[in-house]
């Protein structure tokens, strides 16, 4: 499936539910620890200050030790703004030391910019892309992606952070967004919505998707996570939309076979390692890319996003055990984490193709 | 230091069995994955059988799927190789090694064990 | 006969560069799968050479490096040194579900 931007390209299946976006920020590595705040439904949204929930958790990276021949990765807090202001928002809270973003949820109070200032931000994610209004710029070449085919041992780490299901990372996993532009993956995680109502953070000519999926890197220019937070392409984030499809994703079932396991808010569980490329989209060439933020809190600023036209396919099954397994706190479902889209004031979103 | 101290090797008739030990220091065992790697003699290197670091999962090699059972004890720090139905091809030096580094190398390796199938 | 392919020898002067080859197909080292390289010394335990295609582990000279590219990959050993003399394997991971090796490659320092 592919976004609609040429009339060659499938048309969007069904119309945007009305309910908006609770988790949109893209998460960071190790985001699962952040939380994410929307607006409670029927409260407006603050310009800039929509829900932008702060990516999951982002793990901190330090050097590499040769000896040990992996990267350590520490659980970062990460923002994402707040959500849709008709969309209930899950809390999500993190009680790290130190960590001044502790406390957020979707919707509700405290209002993001309180948790973090950023979050109130010009220039924040997720946002509506309108395909017939980017522009297009040859110089995008296709994503290159090294080392993202893991074998099942060592295993990986499936958290449950309250706001999401997030996928830590070993370190190999290189990312390119073209020459120059080299970035180490994290982490990964979804945003989805509830029985009947999809959850994308981004949206498409205001189509939100069942779900999206965030695959969070670290500029390599950048040892360490709360270094890059902030800086113009400390970060980067793949992003993928999940859509409904008569077929079992094999690839997602490696993850959504877990998901029982890890059904309490904080649990988490080990997974084997697999070819993460196969969770993204084949086509890395079609892409639509801009800069913006973490979408929960902190909702640091100048994280680059790059969106596939290509969507992920997944069963019906599939999404409903993504949307329908897994509890927030105060026993709550973790539902509707995605946060609301925020104004693009000014900026231009780059399409990789005409 | 890091190190990882096999037993257990021996000559055992064809049929018969054995068990292998593989006692780990100075790294924190229970959270690596493992893996035994057996070298027939003048040939080359052949991975057998590995496990997850809390020995839920377990993978083997078809050449010794059913016969073989690879376990371990992460609170005596050892890892475990049970050798049945044992025949003349399994005449090996066999290695444990760590399986704990990201990219699915084995970055440390036991001194091994010789094991004898023979009648 | 072992899934990845080296040649049984090499050899090579003491000074000299030398290079092992290691070939997979499409479910191993073409699948994207990392690629290690081993020295095993006579009647000892294999240590590791080389891990996720070109990394050294704190302790191996430089002189030693890898690379990899589709279906193949490298070993090369720069300024050879009697010490070098041993056996090599290749090893990497293969989609069905085993950790797979080459056959080795005895390199001879003359």
């Known amino acids: 499936q592919r976004l609609p931007r040429m009339q060659e390209d499938s048309p969007l299946g069904g119309g945007s539910s009305g309910e908006d976006d609770p988790l949109g920020e893209e998460d960071l590595p190790s985001e699962e620890d952040s939380p994410r705040e929307e607006d409670p439904p029927g409260e407006e949204d603050l310009p800039g200050e929509e829900d932008l929930p702060g990516e999951e958790d982002l793990p901190e990276v330090k050097p590499k030790s040769e000896e040990e021949g992996s990267l350590k990765l520490e659980d970062l807090p990460t923002v994402e703004a707040p959500g849709d202001p008709q969309e209930p928002q899950n809390n999500a809270h993190r009680d790290k030391e130190g960590d001044d973003q502790s406390h957020w949820r979707y919707g509700g109070d405290p209002p993001w910019p309180r948790v973090s200032p950023a979050c109130a931000g010009r220039f924040q994610s997720p946002v509506d892309i309108r395909p017939q209004l980017a522009a297009f710029c040859p110089a995008l070449r296709p994503l290159e992606l090294l080392g993202f085919q893991l074998p099942p041992l060592p295993e990986l780490r499936l958290r449950n952070n309250g706001h999401s299901v997030q996928l830590t990372l070993p370190p190999g996993l290189e990312m390119a967004l073209g020459p120059g532009r080299e970035y180490r993956a994290l982490q990964l995680h979804l945003h989805w919505g509830a029985a009947g109502r999809p959850g994308s953070e981004h949206t498409v000519e205001g189509h939100r998707f069942p779900a999206e999926i965030h695959v969070v890197h670290l500029s390599t220019a950048f040892a360490r996570v709360d270094e890059a937070l902030g800086r113009p392409g400390g970060l980067a984030v793949l992003a993928a939309f999940l859509e409904e499809g008569p077929e079992e994703n094999s690839a997602y079932e490696q993850l959504l076979s877990r998901l029982e396991e890890i059904a309490e808010e904080g649990s988490e569980t080990q997974v084997p390692g697999l070819d993460i490329s196969a969770l993204l989209p084949s086509d890395f060439s079609r892409y639509f890319q801009y800069e913006g933020s973490l979408t929960t809190p902190p909702c640091a600023q100048g994280v680059i996003w790059t969106v596939f036209n290509q969507t992920v396919m997944l069963s019906a099954k599939q999404l409903h055990t993504l949307s329908d397994t897994l509890w927030g706190p105060g026993d709550s479902r973790l539902q509707l984490n995605f946060r609301a889209t925020q104004p693009l004031n000014g900026r231009v979103i780059e399409a990789s193709f005409p | 230091q890091v190190q990882l101290v096999q037993s257990g090797g021996g000559l055992v008739q064809p049929g018969g069995s054995l068990r292998l030990s593989c006692a780990a220091s100075?790294?924190?065992?229970?959270?690596?994955?493992m893996s035994w790697v057996r070298q027939a003699p003048g040939k080359g290197l052949e991975w057998v059988s590995a496990i997850s670091a809390n020995g839920g999962t377990t993978y083997y090699a078809d050449s010794v799927k059913g016969r073989f059972t690879i376990s371990r004890d992460n609170s005596k720090n050892t890892l475990y190789l049970q050798m049945n139905s044992l025949r003349a091809e399994d005449t090996a030096v066999y290695y444990c090694a760590n399986n704990g580094n990201y990219r699915g190398a084995f970055d440390i390796w036991g001194q091994g064990t010789m094991v004898t199938v023979s009648s | 006969q072992s899934v990845l392919t080296q040649p049984p020898s090499v050899s090579g002067a003491p000074g000299q560069r030398v290079t092992i080859s290691c070939t997979g197909s499409?479910?191993?080292?073409?699948?994207?799968?990392?690629v290690h390289w081993y020295q095993q010394l006579p009647g000892t335990a294999p240590k590791l050479l080389i891990y996720?295609?070109?990394n050294r582990p704190s302790g191996v000279p430089d002189r030693f490096s890898g690379s990899k590219s589709g279906s193949s990959a490298s070993l090369a050993i720069t300024g050879l040194q009697a010490e070098d003399e041993a056996h090599y394997y290749c090893q990497s991971y293969d989609r069905s579900l085993s950790w797979v090796f080459g056959g080795g490659t005895k390199l001879t320092v003359l």
């Open positions: 996720g295609n070109s």
């Open positions: 499409s479910s191993n080292i073409g699948a994207g799968y990392d």
């Open positions: 100075g790294f924190p065992f229970s959270s690596y994955a």
